[in-house]
Interface confidence: low
């Protein structure tokens, strides 16, 4: 791991973060019925899942642990400059490296700082540069980077040959692994002909390891099991039902646009976040149950949002897969009840990606400055930026670009509790609609 | 001693192609960014393109990017500028330059721009119909 | 992009003057500027990078300074080979972008 600046921040993690408010119930749209011991095993199972991944995502992000930003000019401490820094020709003052465009990872006597790498055509940037920490780059899914030719990603073979059965997916950094069925060996060669091909479908989730899969998969079955007869036996029950079942067997109509004031505000996040107490001691995103991916290949088989829903609903299985549209609850100017959501917006962002997401988001360094300069005090910095943001692009400043730009900085779990308090704060509500829609 | 050398300039009609060559000695070519520089008549200076010292890297001004094309040849020593669809403001005299930060092999660092410290006598390009 | 505004444009000086040029940038470029003269029908010499670093074999007389958005190119006392264009360049970010030149005449 890198070495931090003396006066680095800790990692993101322990951030404040907004306690359960008013959300409106979502419920699935009309399916079959379900049993109701199935039911509750299911969303556990979904809740389990959703903790695993937020726990996952919260480790992924852990290295923010980037330097505290410090002033254009220092003084070198020993003939040395801090991280993110690089010392001036005169050997006298330390000058801060460029975001996103070089960096230093430690106490240097450099007269410059080391250009960040940028990540090829066929890769993802996992993480961006800062001033220090250079880029991090990955291949794109369906490609590899093998050991002996790490200069280019390589497509992963689509299916196993004739007679051999797979064994391990195609990840970032192997192709998929084949093995005859009877002898069990490895096979190495080029895959033959399409037609002779056992294809592999290309939405399965990278695993490394098949049967470390199976063993949690199975554990986390055993542990389903029991806290499902806990919370059975728990004075809980009554309380989850009736929102289990809404959840799992809605009554018909849009769930979308449930009439929230029949509602008692937060009943159902407190019923939520018992359960959630009870599943898994350590934060959780209060998102529905749908299942964020993690960043980074786990070996646990988890469920994809779209394969948590068909596991809910069967007759509706050959559906494409949906985006979920965030829509202002009361029909309401998007960018301006996006505007009054800003104010909360600094605990739900590690300090450390504020500055990267209002350039993802189209801010220049001196607007980045200036507002950094005329907000009221720390806290309140975030707000300026994203106030000169829709100034800036006015009706193109959507909650979907911030969101994007979230996931695009690698910050899940910020966008997950971003998304969730626009939910909550009964300001935005989920509107469905087709992945491709272009709505603000 | 060290020199650039451009040449390919000439007169092209709105709309074709022209390639620009750089030629550069008297240092280790391979471990400096490149870069091309223009200047229209009467005008001030234009940064154009800069292409890194293993061609791993290329970026481009507004005004010419999708249209031009910066690239390196270590093993030839030469830079190049490969310019299509012209237009009547490309017409210029068109500089190659050296970037004054220099790639070492024996640590990872490469620098960024700290200015152009060896320039060519410049080839001249003249757009017109 | 980041403009960069020269000024003035041009400017009549005698033997032995103190000349200042400036350069401002559109937003903060920190200390990532660089100053350059061009005398007619050559090309153009790097002077100072980085604000304030001398090139190898540029006179004494010639000095930098600045930060930010607001820098000063400053000729302590102007000499007859001093005559010529100058040039401030931004490298704090692509597309490397120059000021519009100013153009040190004899008065």
């Known amino acids: 791991m890198e070495q931090r600046g003396q006066n680095a921040p800790a990692a993101s993690g322990a951030r404040k973060r907004h306690g359960p408010g008013p959300r409106e119930a979502r419920g699935a749209r009309p399916g079959p019925r379900v049993p109701k011991t199935l039911v509750l095993v299911v969303a556990a199972v979904l809740l389990l899942v959703s903790a695993e991944s937020a726990l996952i995502t919260q480790q992924d992000l852990a290295p923010q642990q980037r330097a505290a930003p410090q002033q254009k000019r220092s003084s070198p401490s020993e003939g040395l400059c801090p991280p993110g820094h690089h010392i001036s020709e005169d050997g006298r003052d330390c000058i801060s490296c460029k975001y996103g465009q070089d960096y230093s990872t430690h106490w240097n006597d450099l007269l410059f700082c080391l250009r960040c790498t940028r990540c090829d055509s066929g890769e993802v940037e996992l993480s961006p540069c800062t001033t220090t920490r250079n880029t991090v780059c990955q291949c794109e899914e369906g490609t590899f980077r093998e050991e002996d030719s790490p200069e280019m990603c390589r497509k992963c073979r689509t299916g196993c040959p004739r007679g051999m059965v797979k064994v391990g997916d195609c990840t970032p950094w192997s192709d998929i692994e084949c093995v005859h069925k009877e002898s069990g060996t490895k096979h190495s060669g080029e895959v033959p002909a399409v037609e002779e091909t056992v294809t592999s479908s290309p939405g399965t989730p990278a695993s490394p390891c098949s049967l470390s899969g199976i063993i949690i998969g199975v554990t986390v079955a055993a542990v389903v099991l029991i806290v499902a007869v806990f919370v059975c036996k728990s004075l809980l029950w009554k309380k989850v039902l009736p929102y289990l079942k809404g959840i799992c067997s809605g009554g018909g109509g849009d769930p979308e646009r449930v009439d929230r004031s029949s509602q008692r505000p937060g009943a159902e996040d407190n019923v939520l976040n018992e359960i959630v107490s009870i599943l898994q001691p350590t934060q959780v995103p209060e998102q529905e149950m749908e299942v964020q991916e993690p960043a980074e290949p786990t070996g646990v088989n988890m469920l994809s949002p779209g394969e948590s829903e068909h596991l809910l609903e069967p007759a509706e299985a050959e559906r494409s897969q949906r985006r979920r549209l965030l829509v202002p609850a009361n029909e309401g100017d998007p960018t301006e009840t996006l505007r009054q959501c800003f104010d909360d917006f600094a605990d739900l962002v590690p300090f450390d990606s504020w500055e990267p997401l209002m350039r993802k988001l189209g801010l220049m360094d001196n607007e980045i400055k200036v507002a950094k300069a005329e907000a009221a005090g720390h806290r309140d910095t975030l707000y300026t930026m994203l106030i000169k943001w829709v100034n800036k692009t006015g009706r193109d400043a959507s909650v979907h670009t911030l969101l994007d730009a979230l996931e695009t900085l690698g910050e899940r779990l910020a966008k997950q509790k971003i998304e969730d308090h626009l939910l909550s704060s009964g300001k935005f509500m989920y509107l469905e609609g087709n992945a491709d829609s272009a709505m603000s | 001693q060290v020199q650039l050398v451009e040449s390919g300039g000439g007169v092209v009609q709105p709309g074709r192609s022209l390639r620009l060559s750089c030629a550069a000695s008297?240092?280790?070519?391979?471990?400096?960014?490149m870069h091309w520089v223009r200047q229209a008549p009467g005008k001030g200076l234009e940064w154009v393109a800069v292409i890194w010292y293993d061609g791993s890297n290329k970026y481009y001004a507004d005004s010419v990017k999708g249209r031009f094309t910066i690239s390196r040849d270590n093993s030839k020593n030469t830079l190049y500028l490969q310019m299509n669809s012209l237009r009547a403001e490309d017409t210029a005299v068109y500089y190659c330059?050296?970037?004054?930060?220099?790639?070492?092999?024996?640590?990872?660092?490469?620098?960024?721009?700290?200015?152009?410290?060896?320039w060519g006598q410049g080839t001249t390009v003249t757009v017109s119909s | 992009d980041i403009q960069m505004t020269q000024s003035p444009s041009s400017l009549s000086a005698s033997v032995g003057d103190r000349v200042t040029i400036t350069c401002r940038a559109s937003?903060?470029?920190?200390?990532?500027l660089n100053w350059y003269q061009q005398k007619p029908g050559k090309a153009p010499k790097l002077l100072i990078s980085?604000?304030?670093s001398f090139q190898s074999g540029v006179p004494s007389r010639f000095s930098g300074s600045g930060s930010g958005t607001d820098f000063t190119l400053t000729i302590s006392s102007l000499q007859p080979e001093d005559f010529a264009a100058y040039y401030c360049q931004q490298s704090y970010s692509t597309p490397l972008t120059f000021g519009g030149g100013t153009k040190v005449e004899i008065k």
């Open positions: 330059a050296r970037d004054r930060t220099v790639y070492s092999s024996s640590s990872p660092f490469y620098y960024y721009y700290y200015g152009m410290d060896v």
């Open positions: 008297g240092f280790t070519f391979s471990t400096y960014g």
């Open positions: 980085a604000t304030s």
């Open positions: 937003q903060s470029i920190s200390s990532y």
